[in-house]
């Protein structure tokens, strides 16, 4: 998986005058990692782990970044001609990523009202939207705006894509925390499903980095894919990770069947109880 | 229409500068797009160059960077190649294309490096 | 730089056959940034499919393509003669933009 950083920024207008202030969110490796506190005006890291990864420095240059960001985009929704009476949303999603063989993705989504009608790929400058008449017409209105000043938005998403990885960078160089491997605790769990039947659960969860394989095994065999169901794996809020796998097999059979689990190059195997 | 068309000398003695010239007609090269060049030695490949895109933007493949520039002339609708020091094994056909996923192409020309 | 390997290297097929032909990448690609193309000899390359499934203009309906991730697959239902090209991947996510070595797809 990918080391990223994922800026999500929104602000509002309300019968066609755009509201001050705006909503942010960072996450870091998919982790809630930031939040943009509007009483304060600030930058606030999202629970321990995020304050951890940064240790005791300031959030100021966040603080300064996200300002920055969220002004750009007011500036945008005032350019939006289709906004009619009532609150209307514009939301940019920006995500940068540092790959394992070192190369970088940078992208940039803009959605209106929930609906998204434009994407850049920051790297090669490539604009795509969707078939829609209103993402078509929405995204041209806002290409053309940010046309209206090319050399001033042309530096500016270069310089977001390069601060973005030049701060997801920091972020990896300054933390022990995203360096660290947290084994996961595995717990198996049984439940009556129908007659003759039982429903086995493997759940794993404290984990990091966010990489697992969890699947049911029969005799030491894998089972197919299409006979187990998996959850997403997803962040438990503390800076871990968590999921699960579950199947359904013959009440008796138990003693057949164990839960395979590999994370970070170790691996176990958890029988169902009795 | 769009069309692209490349155009340039044939020959080029090694050590010297390859220049190519892309003419575009149907479509401004400052409305959209990333403006490219790719290359085909004979019996290889294809191997992109670099690309000037609608904004003036310039990225170049790695392996050739030190010795390739792209530029544009706006006022005519062109964007150039220049490829320095030339070898033999710089000898192939040069196309110029438009986009991202390469949708028009020029017919190519063939240079040839040789004293 | 993300490396693009193309298989087989030579496909030698009859009329009516299926053909289909395979991309793998050293690195994830978005599946926007995927494109086929075909190059028939003496002639310069053009789009056959781009972003990975789409159909470009004038293409036959033959034609498909999938995938996602790091492996993407182009596939001719029912061969024609006039299909004999040689075939490459590319990707558009990354800087250098590069492309698959080919795969030449011979008529038997």
């Known amino acids: 998986e990918p080391h990223s950083l994922r800026y999500n920024l929104t602000v509002l207008s309300w019968d066609g005058s755009v509201q001050s202030g705006f909503l942010a969110e960072v996450h870091l490796d998919g982790q809630p990692f930031l939040r943009y506190d509007r009483q304060k005006c600030r930058a606030k890291p999202q629970g321990q782990w995020a304050e951890d990864v940064l240790g005791n420095k300031t959030w100021d240059r966040e603080t300064r970044d996200l300002t920055g960001n969220g002004k750009d985009l007011r500036m945008t929704l005032a350019h939006i001609k289709d906004q009619k009476e009532g609150l209307h949303s514009l939301q940019e999603i920006r995500v940068c990523e540092i790959h394992e063989d070192n190369s970088t993705r940078s992208s940039q989504h803009f959605y209106y009202d929930g609906e998204l009608f434009l994407s850049q790929n920051v790297e090669t400058e490539e604009w795509t939207v969707p078939q829609s008449s209103r993402a078509q017409t929405l995204a041209m209105n806002v290409r053309n705006f940010l046309k209206e000043d090319a050399m001033k938005t042309k530096t500016h998403y270069h310089a977001m894509h390069a601060d973005c990885l030049q701060e997801l960078r920091r972020y990896l160089e300054s933390s022990v925390v995203l360096r660290r491997r947290v084994p996961p605790m595995v717990n198996v769990t049984r439940s009556e499903a129908s007659e003759g039947n039982i429903t086995v659960t493997c759940r794993a969860s404290s984990f990091y980095p966010r990489n697992i394989t969890l699947t049911w095994r029969q005799d030491g065999v894998s089972l197919s894919h299409d006979t187990q169901q998996w959850g997403d794996v997803l962040p438990d809020g503390n800076g871990t990770y968590q999921t699960w796998v579950a199947t359904r097999i013959c009440q008796g059979e138990e003693q057949r069947f164990t839960c395979y689990m590999e994370h970070s190059g170790n691996h176990s195997t958890h029988p169902v109880p009795s | 229409q769009v069309q692209l068309q490349e155009s340039g000398p044939g020959l080029v003695k090694p050590s010297e500068t390859l220049s190519l010239t892309c003419t575009v007609s149907g479509y401004s090269i400052t409305s959209d797009y990333a403006w490219n060049w790719i290359r085909q030695p004979p019996g290889k490949g294809l191997e992109w160059m670099g690309f000037?895109?609608?904004?003036?933007?310039?990225k170049y493949n790695p392996s050739l960077k030190s010795r390739v520039t792209i530029s544009r002339d706006t006022s005519k609708n062109q964007f150039s190649l220049k490829l320095s020091s030339v070898t033999a094994a710089d000898t192939a056909v040069y196309y110029c294309?438009?986009?991202?996923?390469?949708?028009?192409w020029g017919q190519g020309t063939t240079v040839t490096v040789s004293s | 730089e993300i490396v693009l390997t193309q298989s087989p290297a030579t496909l030698s097929l009859s009329p009516g056959e299926r053909a289909t032909l395979s991309c793998s990448a050293t690195s994830s690609i978005s599946s926007i940034y995927f494109h086929w193309y075909q190059q028939k000899p003496g002639q310069a390359p053009r789009l056959l499919i781009y972003r990975t499934s789409n159909l470009a203009s004038g293409i036959p309906a033959r034609f498909s393509g999938s995938g996602s991730g790091t492996d993407y697959t182009l596939t001719i239902s029912s061969l024609e003669p006039e299909d004999v090209a040689v075939y490459y991947c590319q990707q558009g996510t990354t800087i250098p933009f590069t492309f698959g070595q080919g795969t030449k797809l011979e008529i038997k």
């Open positions: 000037v895109s609608y904004s003036g933007t310039t």
């Open positions: 294309a438009r986009g991202y996923g390469f949708d028009y």
